[in-house]
């Protein structure tokens, strides 16, 4: 018996088709993915084969202005309109805290939302009981699959889930749900989460009876071949893992942003296991026509947000300074608003030890691309903050030991002068550059904010201890040189989209005036 | 207004066949998986056989695998039973259902009102 | 498959009664549970799904718990219109079962 998964994994709302990076679709003819080309191809093979699943691995939730303003509504609209079979739960679908998963997405989806290691407590448990599920049975032709699934037990720290969700451990929640559909004569077992690829791995050889694990989280790209984009492969599609018990278990992942999607050949036999598994990821590029339907629902939608750019958020009475000329040469305040913005939005995780779990930013001045003039009546829109952060990056959190962050504020300064966007603006930290001394060795002082203290202070930077640090996912992935970055990070979980972040903080601020405050010297 | 509409009922002899169709109107059809539910005399129910949106998955309750086939036409808004080899035992009201989702699984919130099916000599 | 074992099989409660009846699946069934209610010569109506979510327009009288093999239905104050037969089912793997159904009469 032969089964086709469709996958998509870390969508992140780019319901309508983006460049190849993944930013804002400017050339149609080159254009890429949104769901009305992935309806098309869905379809296709829907129509051609006959044994077909539509999984989706979680983070459909925030990315770009559709998430902004429909706040996960367009996800269950969508989705529903692309009949996805299941969805499992990814950290993003929290951003908005359980409400603004609960009713945008689990009451409205048609189909199952899954984890089966997050566990409801105290009012929330009859809340939303049946909300979300461990497993789900689906009848496939004549067959049934069963599809359990997982989200990483991080979440807490990446996103809002509140208090009342405990996120255990994926394996040691995984396991008796597995075993309960053994029970119910379901012999062929998808897991479908979003840990990231090395607990897909984990996950394939530790758990008994999974036969099959389609994951996210880690934006991973697989391919068996040569790759038809710019994506480097991680690995062979699927990439294959040998279980504790002996079985080779297929474990696959689509990249990201919809660009791709997953396809993969099972066959099974009668006992429900692998015999065969091949595939690849499809790049849904303009070769696939979209579907008119979807596109025109698509078109239908899009008047809201282009409503929303032009309303004011907040109001600035300073002038927010986000030249080139200020931000690569020196501390510019355009680049402590954003540094303020990127640390408020990761609030959260206090306790009577930490104030909270991270402190620091680092941002490259080159990312900041323009000004805000306060002239305008102080009004800041969504369509200012698109001018300043056009690039449709995000924040994310990274786990560096502090001889990296080091070498990282070295490379800062190691050409200065050159107005090039490696300079670093700042918060959290406290950064002396002595600039008569030889490149590499500039960095006089480096003092940041301590997180396990009643009362936050700058402390020396420690080169052994590990940091969380807060910055672009540009500078994560070694962007403008930061190559230490890249190589030398302990940990990188991708957070929300740039301009979010700085909207939600203005508007929440309501009035803003940053400062040049001695940060960088 | 929601409403399914059973058609296709009435007396048939052993061995024989029947075909129940089902209309569906005031929702879109094929956003839905659709069941057959049946009701002996004086008994309780007992699920036929279910449906998803595209008829790419279906389902049977053993007592009829082999003999009934369900089917549907999403261009038509109907959904229909083709009963063959019809047996005394198959004697029920025949119930239209909508499940609540487009998948199969989930749990039947429309209701028609029934064609009853007799199968005598 | 699945068996849905329903008690009692009818009862008899007096208006404003708080009823309950219990269904007992053969086999865990986390929360894939449903509750109907059939009135006699009408078509049965879905009260309650995933074992403790009301239905749309249902009142609130109605209400189901429980996960696993055990699930109980409840009645907080029984009304003259709640005369019927009530019926679990399991959603959780096809084919899908009905418990044998609860007749249930006004004293």
């Known amino acids: 018996w032969e089964l086709t998964i469709l996958h998509t994994n870390d969508v992140h709302s780019r319901l309508e088709q983006t460049s190849e990076d993944s930013s804002k679709c400017v050339n149609a003819s080159r254009c890429m993915g949104g769901v009305a080309r992935l309806f098309t191809k869905v379809q296709q093979i829907r129509r051609a084969e006959p044994n077909v699943l539509l999984l989706d691995a979680g983070d459909q939730y925030q990315g770009t202005i559709w998430f902004t303003v429909y706040k996960g509504a367009e996800v269950a609209h969508f989705m529903n309109a692309l009949r996805y079979d299941a969805m499992a739960l990814g950290n993003h679908e929290f951003d908005n805290g359980v409400e603004g998963l609960i009713e945008p997405l689990l009451k409205e989806a048609k189909f199952p939302i899954l984890s089966a290691n997050i566990k409801a407590k105290g009012p929330l448990a009859s809340q939303i009981s049946g909300l979300y599920l461990p497993y789900k049975v689906l009848p496939v032709g004549d067959e049934v699959v069963g599809i359990v699934g997982y989200t990483s037990k991080e979440t807490p720290f990446l996103s809002n889930p509140g208090t009342n969700l405990v996120f255990e451990d994926e394996i040691t929640a995984l396991q008796p749900e597995v075993d309960k559909l053994k029970t119910l004569n379901v012999n062929k077992i998808i897991a479908l989460g979003h840990s990231g690829f090395e607990t897909d791995k984990l996950i394939a050889q530790k758990v008994r009876g999974v036969d099959v694990v389609v994951g996210g989280h880690s934006n991973t790209f697989l391919y068996t071949g040569n790759p038809p984009s710019k994506e480097v492969p991680a690995g062979k599609y699927p990439f294959i893992v040998t279980s504790d018990d002996g079985r080779k278990v297929p474990v696959v992942q689509a990249y990201a942003f919809g660009k791709y999607l997953g396809y993969l050949k099972i066959e099974f036999d009668e006992r429900g296991n692998v015999i065969s598994s091949h595939g690849n990821p499809i790049l849904l590029n303009s070769s696939i026509p979209e579907d008119p339907s979807i596109k025109a629902d698509i078109n239908k939608w899009r008047i809201k947000l282009d409503n929303y750019s032009t309303q004011e958020l907040g109001k600035t009475i300073v002038y927010l300074d986000g030249s080139s000329q200020s931000c690569r040469f020196r501390e510019c305040n355009m680049g402590n608003l954003i540094c303020d913005a990127m640390i408020n939005n990761n609030l959260r995780h206090a306790d009577e030890m930490f104030w909270n779990h991270v402190s620091m930013c680092i941002l490259n001045g080159g990312g900041i691309r323009s000004p805000i003039d306060e002239r305008n009546n102080g009004t800041i829109t969504w369509e200012n903050l698109a001018a300043v952060l056009p690039f449709g990056g995000t924040f994310d959190l990274v786990q560096l030991k502090g001889s990296t962050l080091k070498k990282a504020f070295e490379h800062s300064v190691h050409r200065y002068g050159q107005s090039t966007g490696e300079f670093l603006q700042v918060g959290g930290i406290h950064v002396v550059y002595d600039l008569s001394r030889k490149p590499g060795d500039r960095v006089v002082k480096l003092d940041v904010l301590c997180t396990k203290c009643r009362v936050p202070s700058y402390d020396p930077l420690k080169m052994d201890e590990i940091y969380k640090v807060i910055l672009p996912n540009f500078l994560a992935n070694g962007g403008d040189g930061f190559q230490m970055i890249k190589d030398e990070l302990l940990r990188h979980d991708s957070g929300d989209q740039d301009i979010n972040v700085v909207s939600t903080y203005i508007s929440k601020m309501k009035v803003i005036y940053p400062a040049v405050e001695g940060r960088i010297k | 207004e929601v409403q399914l509409v059973e058609s296709g009922g009435g007396l048939v002899q052993p061995g024989r066949s029947l075909r129940l169709s089902c209309a569906a109107s005031g929702f879109t059809f094929d956003d839905y998986a659709m069941h057959w539910v049946r009701q002996a005399p004086g008994k309780g129910l007992e699920w036929v056989s279910g449906i998803s949106w595209s008829s790419g998955s279906i389902g049977y309750a053993d007592s009829v695998k082999g003999r009934f086939t369900i089917s549907r036409d999403n261009a038509k808004n109907s959904l229909y039973l083709q009963m063959n080899s019809l047996r005394a035992e198959d004697t029920a009201v025949y119930y239209c259902a909508k499940d609540r989702r487009y998948g199969l699984t989930y749990g039947m919130d429309v209701w028609g009102q029934g064609t009853t099916v007799t199968v005598s000599s | 498959d699945i068996q849905m074992t329903q008690s009692p099989s009818s009862l008899s409660a007096s208006v404003g009664d708080r009823v309950t009846i219990t269904c007992q699946a053969s086999q865990d069934i986390t929360n894939y549970l449903n509750w109907y209610q059939q009135k006699p010569g009408k078509a049965p109506k879905l009260l309650i799904y995933d074992a403790s979510n009301l239905e749309t327009g249902v009142p609130s009288r109605f209400s189901g718990s429980g996960s696993g093999t055990d699930f109980t239905f409840t009645i907080s104050s029984l009304q003259p219109e709640d005369i019927a037969t009530y019926y679990c089912?399991?959603?959780?793997?096809?084919?899908?079962?009905f418990g044998g159904g609860t007749k249930v009469e006004i004293k």
């Open positions: 089912q399991q959603s959780v793997v096809l084919p899908f079962t």
